[in-house]
Interface confidence: low
């Protein structure tokens, strides 16, 4: 009922709580002497459903039959309207529309851990929209029964607060849940179980790992479990992997040997427990243990390459380069690389440990036969050495690969193709494709990249350390025993017209012609591989078209003669550079007047 209802009453029949689809009769009646002052015949009673008028009647009472009420609560209010005054609230009533509870489904109970308490969950079915009381009953041996109620409209879980013990693990317990509201009641099907069925062990704890003699092959995982645990399952994986390795063990008693772990790898380990082979459920997974396995000596061999540079008539510079071992080959932190240089005929040898670099440069005599061996060392030992005889890689002209080309292949890739050498192609044991950024000074500090290709291949896609708008010097070597032949080409993955032209730094007169010298365009402004330079000239103050001379680009060339200028005429000269994408803007302009005699 709403408010104090001093002036009248609202009655609802058959009940304030009705089944969905039912009809109700609502009566509003005034108490004696509570009508309109002087005009009792003018009483106008109005029935509101929430804020909407649904019926009215002149007199002391009003009857209304209402159908089609929705699920939930509907508020009806009766008001009195008198002439020349506001409506007065008489009384009201709430009607609750709902349904009888459905039979609770999927009743299941669980006890977390041997010391835990029994808790059950179920599915309520459709919402009754009414106050519904759930009673959970558990009956066990010796006529013991536990009962617990919850009065929550969303109730689908109850914890009995009791602990089942393993004294008689085969004893049966039966659980049942009953839902009751004003419109009816319904009980679930009984759920019968034993201690072993419903006890879900606590996850294992205190997980540790031991590596005997710091060896990955002698590894034991230890943990602690509740007393009745019979089965364990272990899962483990490298920390950077998504896939688990799984192991099932019986009667492990808190320890298990793992035989297939990789060295120098961080692993994640988890363990789960179960009380019985085919009864009950697995525990949650334990908290993760993360541990790194010990190092083992490296496997595999380093990929080693080298460059030779002539210094003078008696000396040459050797630069060695090698690639890091993969993680699975290094099997630990590489502490240093050991490089041994040996003169094969005289037996002289020198060994050096290199840390922090994957290259080494030394100067050796040009005479003698030289060999190097390079190995990688971690805390447990060294890899097998890679041995290389130092030879002139481009000496055998007949071994030089033919028709070498370099073409852009998508973003930051260059496809290098070639034809086998004229000399018996079957003599080639392998090709090596080498590339480095082109620097006009021939800078030996520029990083060197290489890849090896099988003798039957005639192409290679290079993508490592390839940047757009940079020109690369690419060499293809054909290796056969202690001989090698090579061919080279320039290539880029992406190009556009150079950003600037060469800067003319000097014009000198020599025997009636002139020599123009220029500074190279900075590498970052070349925008790819340069193909040509152009030298333009025209008479100063003339409107005629300039003349030009186009010179093929060569890395080391920084000057060029022009012999078609007239003496005692002042010329303006400038230069541009071209890539396959186009011509640069002008470089600086220089004026020059040839002093020599006219022919």
């Amino acid at each position: 009922k709403i408010d104090a209802c001093k002036r009248g009453d609202v009655t609802v029949k058959p009940s304030h709580v009705i089944l969905l689809g039912s009809t109700v009769n609502i009566t509003c009646s005034l108490k004696p002497r509570q009508g309109c002052f002087h005009y009792s015949r003018r009483n106008k009673l109005i029935l509101y459903k929430f804020d909407r008028r649904i019926n009215f009647h002149h007199g002391h009472s009003l009857n209304s039959q209402v159908t089609g009420l929705p699920l939930g609560t509907t508020l009806f209010v009766c008001k009195l309207a008198c002439i020349n005054s506001d409506e007065i609230q008489i009384c009201g009533a709430e009607i609750f529309v709902g349904v009888a509870p459905e039979q609770p489904q999927n009743l299941s109970c669980i006890q977390k851990g041997e010391q835990g308490t029994v808790a059950c969950t179920w599915e309520r079915g459709r919402d009754t929209h009414l106050y519904t009381e759930y009673t959970l009953q558990l009956s066990g041996p010796k006529n013991l029964t536990w009962q617990k109620q919850c009065k929550d409209i969303y109730c689908d879980y109850l914890d009995f607060g009791i602990n089942l013990t393993p004294e008689s693990p085969e004893s049966n317990f039966t659980a049942k849940v009953t839902a009751v509201n004003s419109l009816g009641s319904s009980s679930s099907l009984p759920s019968t179980f034993t201690f072993l069925d419903i006890v879900r062990p606590l996850p294992p704890w205190d997980i540790r790992i031991k590596f005997q003699k710091a060896s990955v092959s002698r590894c034991t995982l230890y943990w602690r479990d509740e007393g009745l645990v019979l089965l364990n399952r272990l899962r483990y994986r490298p920390s950077n992997s998504r896939l688990w390795n799984m192991v099932n063990v019986t009667k492990a008693k808190g320890r298990h040997d793992l035989l297939d772990l990789k060295p120098f790898t961080e692993y994640e380990f988890q363990i789960s427990s179960k009380l019985h082979l085919y009864k009950g459920s697995w525990s949650d997974w334990s908290e993760s243990l993360r541990a790194q396995t010990p190092e083992e000596e490296p496997t595999g061999m380093l990929d080693v390459w080298y460059m030779k540079r002539h210094i003078d008539y008696s000396r040459q510079q050797i630069s060695l380069f090698w690639k890091n071992l993969s993680v699975s080959e290094a099997r630990g932190k590489i502490l240093h690389y050991q490089v041994t240089l040996q003169e094969l005929t005289g037996g002289k040898a020198m060994t050096q440990n290199i840390t922090g670099h994957t290259s080494w440069t030394t100067v050796i005599p040009r005479t003698g036969n030289w060999a190097v061996a390079v190995s990688a060392a971690n805390s447990k030992g060294s890899s097998l050495p890679t041995r290389i005889n130092i030879m002139n890689l481009c000496e055998a002209g007949l071994l030089a690969p033919r028709q070498v080309s370099a073409n852009s292949e998508g973003m930051d890739n260059i496809l290098v193709t070639w034809q086998p050498p004229r000399k018996d192609p079957s003599a080639v044991q392998e090709y090596v494709v080498e590339w480095r950024e082109l620097h006009p000074g021939g800078d030996t500090q520029v990083p060197l990249n290489w890849l090896r290709s099988r003798p039957y291949n005639v192409s290679a896609l290079i993508s490592e350390n390839i940047k757009s708008y940079i020109c690369y010097e690419i060499r293809v070597y054909a290796l056969s025993g202690d001989q090698g032949g090579c061919s080279s080409i320039l290539g880029n993955s992406k190009h556009k017209a150079p950003l600037s032209g060469p800067h003319i730094n000097a014009i000198t007169e020599e025997k009636g012609s002139i020599l123009i010298s220029w500074n190279s365009i900075p590498v970052q402004e070349q925008m790819g591989c340069l193909l040509h330079y152009r030298i333009y000239w025209k008479e100063r103050d003339s409107n005629s078209q300039p003349q030009l001379c186009e010179i093929p680009y060569r890395v080391s060339q920084n000057s060029h003669p022009i012999n078609s200028l007239q003496p005692r005429v002042t010329y303006v000269l400038w230069m541009t550079a071209l890539t396959a994408a186009g011509e640069s803007s002008h470089g600086n302009e220089r004026e020059f007047c040839l002093q020599g005699k006219a022919n």
Epitope: A119, T121, Y154, C155, D156, Y157, L158
Partner: nanobody
Amino acid sequence: QVQLQESGGGLVQAGGSLRLSCAASGRTFSNYAMAWFRQAPGTEREFVAGLSGSGGDTAFYDNSVMGRFTISRDSAKNTMWLQINNLKPEDTAVYYCAAATHVVVSYGLVRRRGTYDYWGQGTQVTVSS
């Protein structure tokens, strides 16, 4: 490491509204159960609203806040919200955000403190009459 950070609390008059936020970092909880709890001085921490974490995210509410509170989340931003309307003095409490590392589809389990693995530091909501 995983962190939950609540914000949006404050002093508000009865009948007013607030929007609490919970930002999760260090882990993605978009597929897992998350909830709001509150604790008034001298009382136990109580469940307010929760999300199941299953596909389609079922929302659960305590009877006392049904209709006034709305829980939601943005999985892409790893953020959960609690919109509180028509605030009452009895809503005064520290509001905590909680996250599980599993899906919870039972109302009974959603409202249990032990269901959740991670908790925020809380944000104070004070409602003056």
